[in-house]
């Protein structure tokens, strides 16, 4: 795994313990909580990051309002089960044997059940809508400058291929970033849109996951872009299965 050899750290994930005990004495970094070795040349999967976060719990974040149009991460933090590749297992259960199915970004997509609940496959989240409201500024941002800056951010900071940033919409003060990535489009080595969105979400909240880097300093033509609220909507390749009771609630 590529990690800074001089001081053996993981540039892309500060929630790791790194030691020079890899093959040939190379630096090896293991995610807190799971102990899984991570590739420090790219983003760590959201599942491993959540597991690491739960191993050193902080205050649970505020819950977002649910949406009838798409899945929203409305259950807050939980300690997930990750597969050997670091992806979410399709079925998640808590300590009291309450189980539910999740999508590829770990968001619940079924009603909660018991241990008999079956989740046949991990359903891919292929469309993520990041809805931001920025703080008041002297004037509106130039749409094309804003578009270019956000695309650059996802490309350079999160290593997400530009083709997966489908659109950037802007109607002051609301910014919407659309990420799209079908199973067939994602090649080996491509950053997952779910992981990129999670890193972005943590950056926006001032909780950067990057080691040693400063926090996110978003500027459009030198003007600071300060976000005051974020909502993230997740659309799956197969629609979620909730009971009518929830849908009408």
């Amino acid at each position: 795994h590529t990690a800074a050899q001089d001081n053996c750290t993981c540039p892309t994930n500060k929630m790791t313990v790194c030691s020079p005990d890899g093959p040939g004495g190379r630096c090896q970094c293991r995610a807190l909580g799971s102990g899984m070795a991570v590739d420090c040349s790219t983003l760590t999967s959201k599942c491993l990051l959540l597991k690491a976060r739960m191993s050193a719990p902080k205050n649970a974040r505020t819950l977002v309002r649910p949406s009838e149009h798409a899945l929203v991460d409305n259950d807050g933090l939980y300690d997930p089960d990750c597969d050997p590749e670091g992806r979410f297992k399709a079925r998640q259960c808590n300590q009291t044997s309450v189980c539910w199915c999740v999508n590829s970004v770990g968001v619940r997509r079924t009603d909660k059940g018991d241990l008999s609940l079956r989740c046949d496959e991990l359903v891919r989240t292929h469309h993520i809508l990041i809805d931001l409201r920025h703080r008041p500024t002297a004037g509106a941002f130039n749409h094309s400058d804003l578009d270019a800056e956000l695309r650059r951010l996802f490309r350079e900071r999160y290593r997400l291929h530009p083709k997966f940033v489908a659109a950037v919409h802007y109607e002051q003060p609301t910014i919407q970033i659309e990420l799209r990535q079908n199973t067939s489009q994602k090649a080996a080595g491509d950053v997952d849109i779910g992981d990129a969105a999670y890193y972005f979400e943590r950056d926006i909240k001032g909780e950067s996951l990057f080691q040693g880097r400063g926090g996110l300093d978003l500027r459009v033509r030198g003007e600071p872009l300060q976000v005051e609220r974020t909502l993230i909507y997740y659309l799956d390749e197969i629609p979620p299965k909730f009971s009518m009771k929830r849908l009408t609630a």
């Epitope: 030691s19 005990d21 102990g35 070795a37 050997p84 590749e85």
Partner: antibody
């Protein structure tokens, strides 16, 4: 030469605690994980947890989480494993081991802990 | 927790014979498996890491293979000092776990 030297055998009563030490030499103490593994008489090997001496990060097997504490003293290159609320089934040989690459490359000589009333 | 199942529990062979020991993981662990030899009254000794990479000082008759969930330790020609208990161990994720062991005894 890498060496891990453990403290001597202990006899404890049920409910008591035991603290086993493991002194490392021959390598940079803070750079490598130290694992604790135990082996009950005639049984297999059981991983108890580990500690990274550089920053004292510990990770415990759920089975022992409420009873085990691993600490380190960098000034003496020593790691400690304390097991509390001892019961007869904790009678075992306790090993410390230094983790390299993918396996436990270096082992202490083992410390026999006997729990008996 | 990743469960490692070793088979057979006991292997009765004669010196000079080939020994094949199996270790099966409950889920895919890539090649994050190590093999150990343990003799009575001694600490375990690391033989193989990363499923197939030999450790310096370990005789060439010990070799490992496999990936994913199925792993094998092979001793090409048993020497008298090879009769011992052999354990596999995974380091894919915490908690690290060991197999139950295979005892290689003289027939």
């Amino acid at each position: 030469e890498v060496q891990l030297v453990q403290s001597g055998a202990e006899v404890k009563k049920p409910g008591a605690s035991v603290k086993v030490s493991c002194k490392a030499s021959g390598y940079t103490f803070t750079s490598y994980w130290i694992n604790w593994v135990r082996q009950a008489p005639g049984q297999g090997l059981e991983w108890m947890g580990n500690i990274y001496p550089s920053n004292s990060y510990t990770n415990y097997n759920q089975k022992f989480k409420d009873r085990v504490t691993m600490t380190r003293d960098t000034s003496t290159s020593t790691v400690y494993m304390e097991l509390s609320s001892l019961r007869s089934e904790d009678t075992a040989v306790y090993y410390c081991s230094s983790y390299r690459s993918d396996g436990f490359a270096y082992w202490g000589q083992g410390t026999l802990v006997t729990v008996s009333s | 927790e990743i469960v490692l199942t070793q088979s057979p529990a006991t292997l009765s062979l004669s010196p000079g014979e080939r020994a094949t020991l199996s270790c099966r993981a409950s889920q895919n662990i890539g090649t994050s498996i190590s093999w150990y030899q343990q003799k009575p009254g001694q600490a375990p000794r690391l033989l193989i890491e990363f499923a197939s990479e030999s450790i310096s000082g370990i005789p060439a008759r010990f070799s490992g293979s496999g990936s994913g969930t199925d792993f094998t330790l092979t001793i090409s020609s048993l020497e008298p000092e090879d009769f011992a208990v052999y354990y596999c161990q995974q380091s894919n994720s915490w908690p690290f776990t060991f197999g139950g062991g295979t005892k290689v005894e003289i027939k």
